[in-house]
Amino acid sequence: RKIPKVGHTFFQKPESCPPVPGGSMKLDIGIINENQRVSMSRNIESRSTSPWNYTVTWDPNRYPSEVVQAQCRNLGCINAQGKEDISMNSVPIQQETLVVRRKHQGCSVSFQLEKVLVTVGCTCVTPVIHHVQ
Amino acid sequence: RKIPKVGHTFFQKPESCPPVPGGSMKLDIGIINENQRVSMSRNIESRSTSPWNYTVTWDPNRYPSEVVQAQCRNLGCINAQGKEDISMNSVPIQQETLVVRRKHQGCSVSFQLEKVLVTVGCTCVTPVIHHVQ
């Protein structure tokens, strides 16, 4: 699902207040709800009728440093006999997510939000076939 | 997929540098890659064999203010005849994502990262049945 544009309002102070100096804001250390964890089916990526593989990208100047991307294994879906059925399609499910980018020059460290597109998994869909003109 | 704990290292300055004052950091305004957009199959949530509905949660002190959660419509999966088959299960695909929480007292505005669990969609899996005791 998509993240709307910042629109330069969310991160601004109320109009009656002095503006933010130097185009930066105060970000408190620590993460709210840091201990929350996903609770998905075990080996969901292998048991799905639209199975997928995971690829890990790593960047030490990004938080989280590890971002995992899914890729659908097949074009079709896996039927009850374990065979690929191309009358149905395996398609990726994407999500827009935020990460934090770290920028440093010597002892001057600043951070900036970055939008990343993550493919989270795959689902099996009925293909849409448009009529030939 | 899961976001690791901050571990108090990513947001710290190098050891040779003076510590961050008051437990906060500098967050630059603006979002990198803000114009990136998801490119998913149209009506994927209705065409899937594990279809889902979307629920929107809204919070003006969160960025993004709108967070969309998916919920699987069925417990089973939809077969070729359009009937629900409970020998297969529709299961949620979850993603840990970051949002920004805005906290203000008068003209003093600060921000903090928050971890949110988002159900992005659903996929159809073979259920795992463990041995009866």
Epitope: - | L75, P92, P127, V128
Partner: nanobody, 118 residues
């Protein structure tokens, strides 16, 4: 650990009714889905009915649709299976199952015998 205890099975004539109950207990019980499956002698296990704990959404195998109803009582941590218009082919051991993680039925009861005579 989650414990599931079924009751309500028995011998009934074709066309009769039974109501099975499954009480869930254990540390911090919170299941995604609970359900009933059955196994007749020499047959594969089959899911009969499922219910999502959070919102009560249900699913049934075709052979019991319109005859069986699954329901839950959150306050009592109990799931019920109301079985009407029973047929001899419904004879089986009925097991209660819980999936704390979606699709992973890690917890099972000991089973209750249902016998439908003609």
């Amino acid at each position: 650990e989650v414990q599931l205890v079924e009751s309500g099975g028995g011998l009934v004539q074709a066309g009769g009714s039974l109501r099975l109950s499954c009480v869930a207990s254990g540390r911090a019980f919170s299941s995604y889905v609970m359900g009933w499956f059955r196994q007749a002698p020499g047959m594969e296990r089959e899911f009969v009915a499922l219910i999502r704990w959070s919102d009560g959404i249900t699913g049934y195998v075709d052979s019991v649709k319109g005859r069986f109803t699954i329901s839950r009582d959150n306050a009592k941590n109990t799931v019920y299976l109301q079985m009407n218009s029973l047929k001899p082919e419904d004879t089986a051991v009925y097991y209660c199952a819980a999936a704390v993680r979606p699709g992973d039925y890690d917890y099972w009861g000991q089973g209750t015998q249902v016998t439908v005579s003609s």
